[in-house]
Interface confidence: medium
């Protein structure tokens, strides 16, 4: 729980399609993509690997063949089940030396329509370098989308795009502890469009969740819940058609 987090000082827009390895290291970052126009990327996310990061590990690849914008998502049934047996998911906040969540994933729901609201189990909680990917299409005339990373009855991270809050589009992030919502963090950059496909990627970092939408970095949310291994479920709800929800280690 160090104080010296890097928040989203670092937003792409510098012309580097893969600043500091986020998110192009695993996405299909289109040319020229990059979050907030005009924002600089001044060597941000200290301690993170430089561009072209994660040496020696193959990038997770590009979901070839999925419907619409996400060519090539695996066919139904392709995702293997998560590892089983004692010790597969250590309770510490960091992966073990042998690789708690092996990088072989992804694990989760097979591609194809999923019933919303949908719960994606995260059996060992979340750990740094874990990447959660959600593919779907926003329904026409959508009102809201919600991702809820849940720790028992608490919501460690609530990611809530709102399509019409007082005639404005806004993304609200928050945490619910003891049945009380905390202080909201609001983001006016809004990459979702009614009727259009989307890809949400949530990367777990030691100090924060990092969110990218359609391969562009969107926001960062500092952890307000310390024991990441207790965040054991992701709830996905709202006005979407959900194609797939999965996680892997990068």
């Amino acid at each position: 729980m160090a104080d010296n987090f890097s928040l989203h000082d670092a937003l792409s827009g510098s012309g580097n399609p893969n600043p500091q390895g986020w998110p192009g290291a695993w996405g299909n970052q289109p040319a020229g993509a990059g979050g907030y126009p005009g924002a600089s990327y001044p060597g941000a996310y200290p301690g993170q690997a430089p561009p072209g990061a994660y040496p020696g590990q193959a990038p997770p690849g590009a979901y070839p063949g999925a419907p619409g914008a996400y060519p090539g998502a695996p066919a139904p049934g392709v995702y293997p089940g998560p590892p089983s047996g004692p010790g597969a998911y250590p309770s510490s906040g960091q992966p073990s030396a042998t690789g708690a969540y092996p990088a072989t994933g992804p694990y989760g729901a097979p591609a194809g329509p999923l019933i919303v609201p949908y719960n994606l189990p995260l059996p060992g909680g979340v750990v740094p370098r874990m990447l959660i990917t959600i593919l779907g299409t926003v329904k026409p005339n959508a009102n809201r989308i919600a991702l809820d990373f849940q720790r028992g009855n608490d919501v460690a991270f609530h990611f809530n795009p709102r399509f019409n809050e007082n005639n404005r589009r806004v993304i609200v992030c928050n945490t619910k502890l003891d049945n009380n919502w905390g202080r909201e963090e609001r983001q006016s950059v809004f990459p979702f469009e009614s009727g259009k496909p989307f890809k949400i990627q949530v990367l777990v970092e030691p100090d924060h969740f990092k969110v990218a939408v359609n391969d562009a970095h969107l926001l960062q949310y500092n952890h307000r819940v310390k024991k990441l291994n207790e965040i054991s479920k992701l709830g996905i709800s709202g006005d979407i058609d959900l194609t797939s929800a999965s996680y892997t280690m990068i």
Epitope: A2, D3, D9, R183, Q220, N222, R224
Partner: antibody, heavy 122, light 111 residues
Amino acid sequence: EVQLQQSGAEVVKPGAPVKLSCKASGYTFNNYWLNWVKQRPGRGLEWIGRIDPSDSETHYNQKFKDKATLTVDMSSSTAYIQLSSLTSEDSAVYYCARGDYYYGTRGPMDYWGQGTSVTVSS
Amino acid sequence: DIVLTQSPASLAVSLGQRATISCRASESLDNSGISFMNWFQQRPGQPPKLLIYAASNLESGVPARFSGSGSGTDFSLNIHPMEEDDAAMYFCQHSKEVPWTFGGGTKLEIK
């Protein structure tokens, strides 16, 4: 209702230690940092340090590193501060304050105890 | 350590008028567009009460006559219109990094 109930006033001899308590109620104790703040008359407020009850992680103001020790008792939702080798400079009101997790560890101190007066006198 | 310099040390304002208290930090309190400056009110014999967090966010239950502004190194607390109940000490405090520090305080009185 969130409440932080602090122990009563103390009069302590120079060189002696003292241990103050702060009992939390109305929220889940291990979800929030617990801060300690010193206030001397006419000398403003000084942040001593904080403790995370979930795992007893502590962050201290270096100025108080050798003076204060922060601990918690999870079973009773109580935080403690032990002050060692007291001198007249330690005469003050000591407050505990809950640290909200807004923006991670940088959240504001949103609920405060009523304070404990410590007087160092021979 | 980050030093917070608060001014004025004391201030007398007529009821219904505006009170402005300033706080200058020895280095920027900004991180990613968020300014980690908080404001507290303290009445005699009571603990400090959070009024404003992250420079401009009004704490729940605090009257809207209180407002905060600023970024980087310069911040201010405004009270308008001044009410009798507002006579108190006011402190700025940063939470950008450990150790957290407070300003020296401003004593606000009714003129």
